[in-house]
Interface confidence: low
């Protein structure tokens, strides 16, 4: 009987990577392409339809367009190899390869896709009043992850984690975690993204810098003090201008000059 074999019935691949799934079929001597039929499907989505020596791209599901191909040179070795590039989370599922060559047979192959929380963005900011540091770690991945904060002396610290959907891909999670702590320069903290799926942890190291500029969140201080200082400045400037020149036009010039010269640097320390 005509029988297909698979060397692996489970493939685990990383998001954005490539995978080649293989079904083997018996070939004696030279392959007759006109007698060969190869179908690759995934949950009713047609991926490959190879009939009469030709691949019919018209039937290919749009989600696999430009990403899935049958490796033609492998057919002559008795392998129906489906290559998927730039693997997406939606590609996970059960694939079916059906081969007809005299007889016919099919096999199922499972594809699992995971996305490690590898590219961890980090930020450190400080409250100039309380000197409390805010440490932030952010990364995208799949499945959901919890974030564990630890210090260099292995203490587990309590952070606040929020999970949203990624803008890049629907199923990808955007995990952001913050830790508020009193810390001194050169102290080291770690944020670890721990997934519930394949056991793979990803950790970022955050080192408290010597000196930090005032973070954007401290704009609130300026919003409260700003109008008062501005009003005081205007009153003083008007008084000065009127005393010196006694003309309205000079008041406008003086005040404008005073306002424009007042600049503020609101920068956060950021590391990626």
């Amino acid at each position: 009987a005509f029988t297909i074999t698979v060397s692996k019935d489970l493939y685990v691949v990383e998001y954005g990577g490539n995978v080649t799934m293989e079904c083997k079929f018996p070939v004696e001597k030279q392959l007759n392409l006109f007698a060969l039929i190869v179908y690759w499907e995934m949950e009713d989505k047609k991926i490959i339809q190879f009939v009469n020596g030709k691949e019919d791209l018209k039937v290919q599901h749009s989600s696999y367009s430009q990403r899935a191909q049958l490796l033609k040179d492998q057919l002559f070795l008795g392998k129906a190899a489906l290559q998927i590039t730039d693997v997406r989370l939606q590609d996970a599922g059960v694939y079916c390869c059906l081969i007809g060559y005299g007889g016919a047979d099919y096999k199922r192959i499972t594809l699992k896709v995971h996305a490690p929380y590898r590219n961890i963005s980090q930020r450190i900011s400080v409250d100039p009043v309380t000197s409390e540091h805010e440490l932030m770690c952010q990364a995208e991945g799949y499945p959901e992850a919890e974030v564990i904060w630890t210090s260099s002396d292995h203490r587990v610290l309590s952070g606040k984690t929020t999970i949203t959907n990624s803008n890049r891909e629907e199923k990808l999670f955007n995990v952001t975690s913050t830790l508020n702590i009193n810390a001194t320069a050169n102290e080291i903290f770690y944020c670890t993204f721990q997934r519930s799926g394949p056991e793979e942890n990803n950790t970022a190291e955050l080192v408290i810098p010597e000196r930090l500029p005032v973070p954007a969140s401290e704009r609130t201080h300026f919003m409260i003090l700003g109008p008062f200082l501005l009003l005081l400045g205007v009153v003083l400037a008007v008084t000065f201008c009127l005393k010196k020149h006694g003309r309205m036009m000079d008041v406008e010039k003086c005040c404008t000059r005073d306002r424009n010269s007042k600049k503020r640097n609101d920068i956060q320390f950021e590391e990626t």
């Epitope: 392959l31 392409l33 006109f34 020596g53 030709k54 490796l71 033609k72 040179d73 492998q74 002559f76 290559q83």
Partner: antibody
Amino acid sequence: EVQLVESGGGLVQPGRSLKLSCAASGFTFSDYYMAWVRQAPKKGLEWVASISYEDSSTYYGDSVKGRFTISRDNAKSTLYLQMNSLRSEDTATYYCARSAWNYPYWFAYWGQGTLVTVSS
Amino acid sequence: NTVMTQSPTSMFISVGDRVTVNCKASQNVGTNVDWYQQKTGQSPKLLIYGASNRYTGVPDRFTGSGSGTDFTLTISNMQAEDLAVYYCLQYNYNPWTFGGGTKLELK
């Protein structure tokens, strides 16, 4: 025995046109992809164009796209290459090639070539 | 376009030598690479298809290997009739592109 015989080459002025032919025999012409490959004097090989067996799909190299047209007449077992707006860099021996199986690549059979010289 | 860089461009060899011709692709082309032999005054001839498959009638001293970006054609026991120019061809990306060729000459 598979045979491919090119014809139609010669001397032509820049900007003019020329049509090459390739007469095929010894196999069922309509079952195979066909291609044109060229070779400038003392230079390497350059793939020019390919055509599928039922004439629905054509593929071109960047240097000839928009100027050359590959076509076939399955009834006459003949492959053609219509070359327009010829340039001096098109000077080459043009080979007609047949795939090993019914794929666009794996050029297993080649003609003897026909020389095209583009010069004023 | 995918650039196929062949090395060396020429080689002086003796009969019986083991000869290695290399081809490097500018991007991943899988195993979609052929090797062709062209003797002086003749049309090219297909030796290897799909990176490692010897075409019908090709002597087994010719071996193709590699995948991704690096490919090799090996002639295990060089014969006088193997003196020719050897070309690699990638057909993974359109336009399909040949390497510049490697000329094998007698020492």
